[in-house]
Interface confidence: low
């Protein structure tokens, strides 16, 4: 199963790697900065979008947030709404689409460099710094694109999802990134948590496949936050 190259989804959503409140470290998709592979309502259109009732952001898809559908509406009636794209207004990070965060009321790009110090600090705090490197190599991965003569198979090292074979995405595994399978219906997925709330995800899963979104299992609605399982479900 650890590199510190950050993907844009992970910047927005930093789940607890060590059993924090969320208990869902690691899904999302590994991508090169600026390249997004979101799940959620990626394949939805306004025409087929079915409102999904929710109580909190974590019950919605990756590209959604939980809010009242009308401004100043009844707080008791909340549904999953499509995330806000870059330069759109926002009130909190969760409202912004993967790869963005809420700054001064506007969704702005999560430039990897802006977060590097914060993230490395989080890594050390949450996972411990008892690993070592050999031969003076840096911990940061420096994969060269010339490595990739053929598409990576499951478990092989990658830099971005395009380095992986069809049906696989590039996702974090400890400090490395490896090709992992895109998730199918019923498979466990990870609900993204919000920037700054928890530690960096040590593991990631791929996103749910086409026509699927990562949602809380119906029979887990009553469970505590820490034990909730999310699975890939049909829209």
């Amino acid at each position: 199963t650890l590199n510190s190259v950050l993907n844009s989804n992970a910047i927005k959503n930093l789940p607890p790697p060590l059993g924090g409140a969320a208990g869902h470290p690691g899904s999302a998709v590994s991508a090169a900065p600026g390249i997004l592979y979101p799940g959620g309502n990626k394949y939805q259109t306004i025409d087929n979008y079915q409102p999904y009732p929710c109580a909190e952001d974590e019950e919605c898809g990756t590209d959604e947030y939980c809010a009242s559908p009308t401004r100043g509406g009844d707080a008791g009636v909340q549904i999953c709404l499509a995330c806000r794209k870059r330069r759109k207004r926002c009130m909190r990070h969760a409202m912004c689409c993967p790869g963005n965060y809420c700054k001064n009321g506007i969704c702005v790009s999560s430039d990897q460099n802006n977060f590097r110090g914060e993230i490395e600090e989080t890594i050390t705090e949450s996972f411990g710094n008892d690993h070592s490197t050999l031969d003076g190599y840096s911990r940061r991965t420096t994969l060269s694109s010339k490595m990739y003569h053929s598409k990576g198979q499951e478990g092989s090292v990658c830099l971005r999802s395009s380095d992986c074979a069809t049906g696989l995405c590039c996702a974090r595994h400890f400090w490395s990134k490896i090709c992992k399978p895109v998730l199918k219906e019923g498979q466990v997925c990870t609900k993204h948590r919000r920037k700054g709330s928890h530690g960096l995800e040590i593991f990631q899963r791929c996103y749910c496949g086409e026509g699927l979104s990562c949602r809380i299992q119906k029979d887990h609605h009553q469970a505590s936050n820490s034990s909730r399982l999310h699975t890939c479900q049909r829209h």
Partner: antibody, heavy 118, light 112 residues
């Protein structure tokens, strides 16, 4: 197909040293994490150590009980994984498995027995 | 130290279903939805049967399935067959010095 073959096990006295080797074939060795997992006679599996691929800086990880005594390394040109074991103790007696750490330990060797006894 | 707790043994008759539990803490199994299960026949190397809680590697029978709730993961084997008799180990990740943790193993006996 993926093959992992361990060697180098044997009988050694407490305080002694051994170097285990694992010859890999059937996959791009340099692109995968590799690990050692051991199993004491009649006991369960215990993770020992892991090493990343070159491009992640050959980062190494060790279980608390072996840290400072064992050293994992790899030679990608020879498709070989190593475990240098120093200051061996009776409790290190086990079958040592070399495992490819793709998505978890997806391929294992057949193991090599290390016996530490006076 | 065994980080994850499994029953020492379970048994079932051919055709039946059995479930093996694996219990950890919020620092290991409960903190990661990354649980794997391995099958080990006597004198043989372990074989990966389930990864990421409920995913089967290619070549593994769909009679094997996994699940997880809170700090406990489960492996269910349906339509039990004689060749399923083996030791089964769960594995997860953990904080602290030990990054990878295994359960103590469960011996599955297929009766009859």
């Amino acid at each position: 197909q993926v093959q992992l073959v361990e060697s180098g096990g044997g009988l050694v006295q407490p305080g002694g040293s051994l170097r285990l080797s694992c010859a890999a074939s059937g996959f791009t060795f340099s692109s995968y994490w590799m690990s050692w997992v051991r199993q004491a006679p009649g006991k369960g599996l215990e993770w020992v150590s892991s090493i990343e691929h070159k491009d992640a800086g050959y980062t190494t990880w060790y279980a608390a009980g072996v840290k400072g005594r064992f050293t994992i390394s790899r030679d990608n040109s020879k498709n070989t994984l190593y475990l240098q074991m120093n200051s061996l103790r009776a409790e290190d007696t086990a079958v040592y498995y070399c495992a490819r750490h793709g998505i978890d330990f997806d391929h294992w060797g057949q193991g090599t027995l290390v016996t530490v006894s006076s | 130290d065994i980080a994850l707790t499994q029953p020492a043994s379970v048994s079932g008759s051919p055709g039946q279903s059995i479930t093996i539990s694996c219990t950890g803490t919020s620092s290991d199994l409960g903190g990661y939805n990354y649980v794997s299960w391995y099958q080990q026949h006597p004198g043989k190397a372990p074989k990966l049967m389930i990864y990421d809680v409920n995913n089967r590697p290619s070549g593994v029978s769909n009679r094997f399935s996994g699940s997880k709730s809170g700090n406990t993961a489960s492996l269910t084997i349906s339509g039990l067959q004689a060749e399923d008799e083996a030791d089964y180990y769960c594995q997860s990740y953990a904080s602290g010095n030990t990054k990878v943790v295994f359960g103590g193993g469960t011996k599955l006996t297929v009766l009859g």
